[in-house]
């Protein structure tokens, strides 16, 4: 932005500048160019010997300027266009300035003036141009500063040229008021801070409803000596509840929200929220819907899931496999987990209690993501009730629970766990174990064995202990062995059928289990 302090051309000849000597030399004249009247200060004393004609401007108030720019538009006639070349003719003139705190009026003293430069034309007006009224206009610009007084004069010294000043414009430069990155930068005088620092750093202020981002830099711009803004640093962002519209921050429309200062626009309220008011920073959930603490505000509100579907409990001796399917209503969330709880009841007394301590789960029962689990170490002749609860990220925000139950009666002991302890060419030593909690119920153990491939005959041995040695066996022969607990109520669960092989007559101490 240029702030004009003096514009001779714009004044249409109304500026009465001082000429020295008075009545000689410089003269204000009017001409017609492009059918418009133009004014100029002109002098053409090219045949009168040495000249020293001065033209001084009126006093110019400096305002805020430190450096001023002087733009001159002028024409100079070719000395050769005059008869005999006009021996004292020159083709340059001198530009001067003087600072002062007061207007000296008509008191003109050359010694107060400091020369800025000799002004020479790039193009002179030759005879043919003059005759054809082609004005060869020259434009020269000079900078003066720093200025310190209240005002100044310019002066033009003619030393014998044929020159016309058509325009004298004095201005200083400002970086204009500017909006950039939602920051307002004030109109700033273009000054060099120093020779090494030609840019002035200017802090901007965020527009209404804009803020400097947390941990970010405030807005800064640099004003150059040429009055141009450069190198923006930092920025402002529209605060929560507001979005950027051109160079301003506008409140989010009803039904929209913005939760933080960012470059993002306002977002539409998500599903299962109530319509927001203007300038909303979030949208409230509908009744019965919730937001988990970690849920982004842009996410739909959700609710706890319904109970799991189709819970089944399949008894396998002293084990139960629980299977279920996902809830019909997930509540709009993907983070569903399941919890399994266990209750046992004694048939004789009808007494019930929790059984988490006495049973074993195939995986921890409180954050299951799969839809099945196996429960073992169940006691025989006991009624068990299993509850499977479906939970999601908002279940903790309500008191109600979503679960399904399944009951199972355990009539058998858990099958014994059998292993081969020792063997020889004619014998197999077998041991087994059952849970301690079930041992008191066992009366005896029944060991059934037969040669593999012989379906017609088998042998049975009973014992009260946890091991047995089977003798009189054939060498290098595979036997099928099963152990079953016998209780007062009848047979318990049988172990799986194991294959054990006697040693060959060649002998080998190695055991194959």
């Amino acid at each position: 932005k240029e702030v004009v302090l003096l514009d001779f051309a714009a004044m249409k000849g109304e500026l009465g500048w001082l000429t020295h000597p008075y009545g000689k030399g410089w003269d204000l004249m009017q001409n017609i160019m492009d059918d418009m009247p133009i004014y100029m200060y002109s002098v053409c004393n090219v045949v009168s010997g040495d000249q020293d004609n001065w033209l001084r401007t009126n006093w110019v108030y400096r305002e805020e300027a430190e450096r001023i720019f002087i733009e001159l538009k002028f024409t100079v006639r070719d000395c050769n266009s005059f008869p005999g070349g006009a021996s004292s003719c020159k083709e340059t003139f001198n530009l001067y300035y003087a600072e002062s705190d007061v207007d000296y009026g008509t008191n003109f003293q050359k010694r107060q003036f400091t020369k800025i430069d000799t002004i020479a034309p790039d193009e002179i007006t030759v005879s043919s141009d003059f005759e054809a009224r082609n004005v060869k206009l020259n434009v020269e610009e000079r900078m003066v500063g720093p200025l310190t007084r209240k005002g100044f004069y310019l002066a033009f010294q003619d030393i014998g040229a044929c020159v016309a000043l058509l325009s004298v414009r004095v201005y200083y430069k400002k970086c204009p008021e500017m909006l950039q990155s939602l920051a307002r930068f004030p109109e700033t005088i273009a000054v060099a801070v120093s020779d090494t620092q030609p840019l002035a750093t200017v802090a901007g202020t965020c527009v209404d409803h804009a803020v400097v981002p947390y941990g970010g830099e405030g807005p800064l711009m640099h004003c150059t000596v040429d009055g141009e803004w450069l190198v923006p640093i930092g920025q402002c962002l529209c605060q929560e509840g507001y979005e950027k519209v051109e160079d301003a921050c506008r409140a989010c429309s009803p039904g929209f929200f913005k939760s933080e200062a960012s470059e993002s626009p306002c977002l539409e309220c998500p599903e299962h929220t109530l319509p927001s008011t203007e300038g909303a920073t979030s949208c409230q959930c509908e009744e019965g819907y919730f937001r988990a603490p970690e849920d982004p505000l842009s996410m739909s509100c959700t609710r706890p899931p319904s109970a799991p579907n189709y819970l089944t409990a399949i008894g396998m001796g002293a084990k139960v496999e629980l299977r279920w399917t996902a809830p019909k209503d997930t509540g709009g969330r993907q983070d569903i987990v399941y919890s399994v709880t266990c209750e046992q009841c004694w048939p004789e007394s009808g007494e019930c209690g929790p059984c988490e301590a006495s049973v074993r789960y195939s995986e921890p029962p409180h954050a299951l993501t799969r839809t099945s689990v196996t429960v073992s170490d169940l006691e025989p002749h006991m009624n068990y009730t299993f509850a499977v609860e479906a939970r999601n990220g908002v279940s903790g925000l309500v008191t109600s629970r979503s679960f399904r139950t399944a009951s199972v009666s355990i009539n058998q002991t858990e099958p014994p766990k059998v292993r081969l302890e020792d063997r020889s060419t004619t014998s197999l030593s077998v041991t087994w174990s059952i849970p301690v909690s079930q041992q008191s119920r066992v009366w005896k153990y029944e060991v059934t064995y037969r040669k593999k491939g012989d379906a017609n005959s088998y042998n049975v041995r009973r014992t009260e202990g946890f091991s047995v040695t089977l003798d009189d066996l054939a060498p290098d022969t595979t036997y099928l062995v099963q152990v079953q607990a016998l209780t007062q109520e009848g047979q318990g669960a049988g172990s799986k059928v194991h294959e054990f092989q006697t040693l060959s007559t060649e002998g080998s101490a190695n055991m194959a289990v």
């Epitope: 053409c44 100079v76 006639r77 005759e131």
Partner: antibody, heavy 128, light 107 residues
Framework: EVQLLESGGGLVQPGGSLRLSCAAS????????MAWVRQAPGKGLEWVSR????????HYADSVKGRFTISRDNSKNTLYLQMNSLRAEDTAVYYC?????????????????????WGQGTLVTVSS | DIQMTQSPSSLSASVGDRVTITCRAS??????LAWYQQKPGKAPKLLIY???NLHTGVPSRFSGSGSGTEFSLTISGLQPDDFATYYC?????????FGQGTKVEIK
């Protein structure tokens, strides 16, 4: 010394034609703007027409526009005025006049010209 | 067209007198004005151009002034050779118009 010598004047009937000539000497003719100025008997001066140094542009007073034609031959240092459809009010002494910008000590030429040098004139009488 | 009006139309003066002739333009012509002298039966002669500039060879007793619409020609110390008719001419517009003339006669 600058000299301008007009010829071609005389008596002519209304509606008739006449061609005036102006022979120039003592200066570089091709540098000069040339003009015709007339003066009716006992009256003031009236500008008639002008022509630029190299033959253009040309200008005419409203009173003669379309009837008179100004021209020059720089090789012969001669200015001409062809006058057609002559009227009684065209009766006057016709002066050839010249202007040399080199002798005009101004930085910017005036919108038009004044006349630095004049011939002695030639009388044109339009009468029946 | 720009009209040029001279006054007076004629004047009588004696040798040595200071004589001033005025010329008024119907609109501003800046300083684009010339003055001519014409003696009976002779061609006009240029005296002043650009309102105040003396033409080469013209005696310094002749001077011109003015700008805009009001101009004057002054002869300070009238000489016998100066008795003639004086014309002003504007050259602001292409229709270069003359004043009607001022005749300076011997008193």
């Amino acid at each position: 010394e600058v000299q301008l010598l007009e010829s071609g004047g005389g008596l002519v009937q209304p509606g008739g034609s006449l061609r005036l000539s102006c022979a120039a000497s003592g200066f570089t003719f091709s540098h000069y703007m040339m003009a015709w100025v007339r003066q009716a008997p006992g009256k003031g001066l009236e500008w008639v027409s002008r022509i630029g140094p190299s033959g253009g542009p040309t200008h005419y007073a409203d009173s003669v526009k379309g009837r008179f034609t100004i021209s020059r031959d720089n090789s012969k240092n001669t200015l001409y005025l062809q006058m057609n459809s002559l009227r009684a009010e065209d009766t006057a002494v016709y002066y050839c006049a010249g202007y040399d910008s080199g002798y005009d000590y101004v930085a910017v030429a005036g919108p038009a010209e004044y006349f630095q040098h004049w011939g002695q004139g030639t009388l044109v009488t339009v009468s029946s | 067209d720009i009209q040029m009006t001279q006054s007076p139309s004629s004047l009588s003066a004696s040798v040595g007198d200071r004589v001033t002739i005025t010329c008024r333009a119907s609109q501003s012509i800046s300083t684009w004005l010339a003055w001519y002298q014409q003696k009976p039966g002779k061609a006009p002669k240029l005296l002043i151009y650009k309102a105040s500039n003396l033409h080469t060879g013209v005696p310094s007793r002749f001077s011109g002034s003015g700008s805009g619409t009001e101009f004057s020609l002054t002869i300070s110390g009238l000489q016998p050779d100066d008795f003639a008719t004086y014309y002003c001419q504007q050259y602001q517009s292409y229709s270069r118009t003359f004043g009607q003339g001022t005749k300076v006669e011997i008193k």
